[in-house]
């Protein structure tokens, strides 16, 4: 029995594959209960997390992970080095960064051990499953009387991510949000000198190096305005 | 908007030359990667050569008959081919990347490393 799954993290065209064995009439085989289905995220491209709801099995089952990666110079299979556990049952697996090629096809194959023809086989496009690290060191500097520009940095991916700037002021009920490609950097052409404001940022590895769709953490919100703006209105600390 | 504009295709008995260009517009040549990749019928587009960075990368069939160049004034790529042989027969692609040849793993010729393709321009190489 061949099932598609359709992911919510752009790798639709992952296929798992679920092996029957035959079975009385009266009761299903183990062999045909579905396995977790893995869901795998790189975190700044530093490490990579798979993982699975160890919960949804009948009984406890320490399921085990193997990985490859199709048509490529690594398609030997791997098993998991290190586990991740839940309540002393395996629930995921992290690889490391050299384990990991972004631009290759990642094959992860789940199986529990008791019932070796009781596996499951996903593939995933790695560079749409990267997730980086919240913006950092966020700065905010006076272009003029009523303009502000907003700074921030990035470990290591730069120009590989797109941005989504928030902000606020004290008397507003939502965040007014706006798209900044990779030149990270935010100008707020008119700012009203009797209000503060907040804002936050948070960061996306799309679509020069990859087509991810989760975002980073927002960053910490940095603030400016009312008591700090009259205090010194060219020094801007961040703010946790 | 990313372009990549393939040329210098073309027929040619075994043993010619050609020397293929790619002129790209909208993308600065840096540390980036820059790559030809084929396709013959029937069979799966393969790299071809790769540059960036000061580095060349070339798949074992081209070795010391293909060269890959680039010139950044003109914001082209080119690719000499010599010795050439009907086994070369294929359309030819030019493509490019926003990150460097062997960044986050894997190889210089994975294709989901590069994110702009051109239309490609076709070589035939007869016996």
């Known amino acids: 029995l061949n099932t598609t799954i359709l992911t919510p993290n752009g790798n639709e065209d992952a296929t798992t594959d679920f092996f029957l064995t035959s079975m009385p009439t009266d009761s299903l085989s183990v062999s045909t209960l579905p396995l977790p289905e893995v869901q795998c995220f790189v975190f700044n491209v530093e490490y990579m997390n798979c993982t699975w709801n160890s919960s949804s099995e009948p009984q406890p089952t320490n399921l085990t992970l193997h990985y490859w990666y199709k048509n490529s110079d690594n398609d030997k299979v791997q098993k998991c080095s290190h586990y991740l556990f839940s309540e002393e049952i395996t629930s995921g697996c992290q690889l490391q960064k050299k384990e990991i090629h972004l631009y290759q096809t990642f094959v992860v194959q789940l199986q529990d051990p008791r019932e070796p023809r009781r596996q499951a086989t996903q593939m995933l496009k790695l560079q749409n499953l990267v997730i980086p690290w919240a913006p950092e060191n966020l700065t905010l500097r006076k272009l003029s009387e009523s303009q502000l520009e907003l700074n921030w940095n990035n470990r290591f991916l730069n120009h590989c991510l797109e941005h989504l700037v928030q902000y606020r002021t004290d008397w507003d009920h939502s965040w007014t949000e706006q798209s900044v490609d990779y030149r990270h950097k935010f100008s707020l052409p008119s700012v009203d000198g009797q209000k503060r404001y907040t804002f936050r940022v948070r960061s996306r590895f799309n679509p020069l190096c990859g087509s991810a769709q989760h975002w980073s953490e927002w960053s910490h919100p940095i603030h400016w305005g009312s008591n700090s703006s009259k205090e010194n209105p060219f020094l801007f600390a961040l703010e946790a | 908007q990313v372009q990549l504009q393939e040329s210098g295709g073309g027929s040619v008995q075994a043993g010619g030359s050609l020397r293929l260009s790619c002129v790209a517009s909208?993308?600065?040549?840096?540390?980036?990667?820059m790559g030809w990749f084929r396709q013959a019928p029937g069979k799966e587009r393969e790299g071809v050569a790769a540059?960036?960075?000061?580095?060349?990368y070339y798949a074992d069939s081209v070795k010391g008959r293909f060269t890959i160049s680039q010139d950044n004034a003109k914001n082209t790529l080119y690719l000499q081919m010599n010795s050439l042989k009907p086994e070369d027969t294929a359309m030819y692609y030019c493509?490019?990347?926003?990150?460097?040849?062997?960044?986050?793993?894997?190889?210089?010729?994975?294709?989901?490393?590069?994110?702009?393709w051109g239309q490609g321009t076709q070589v035939t190489v007869s016996s």
């Open positions: 493509a490019a990347a926003w990150v460097a040849c062997l960044e986050f793993g894997g190889s210089w010729y994975d294709l989901a490393r590069y994110k702009h």
């Open positions: 540059l960036g960075g000061g580095s060349t």
């Open positions: 909208g993308y600065t040549f840096s540390s980036y990667c």
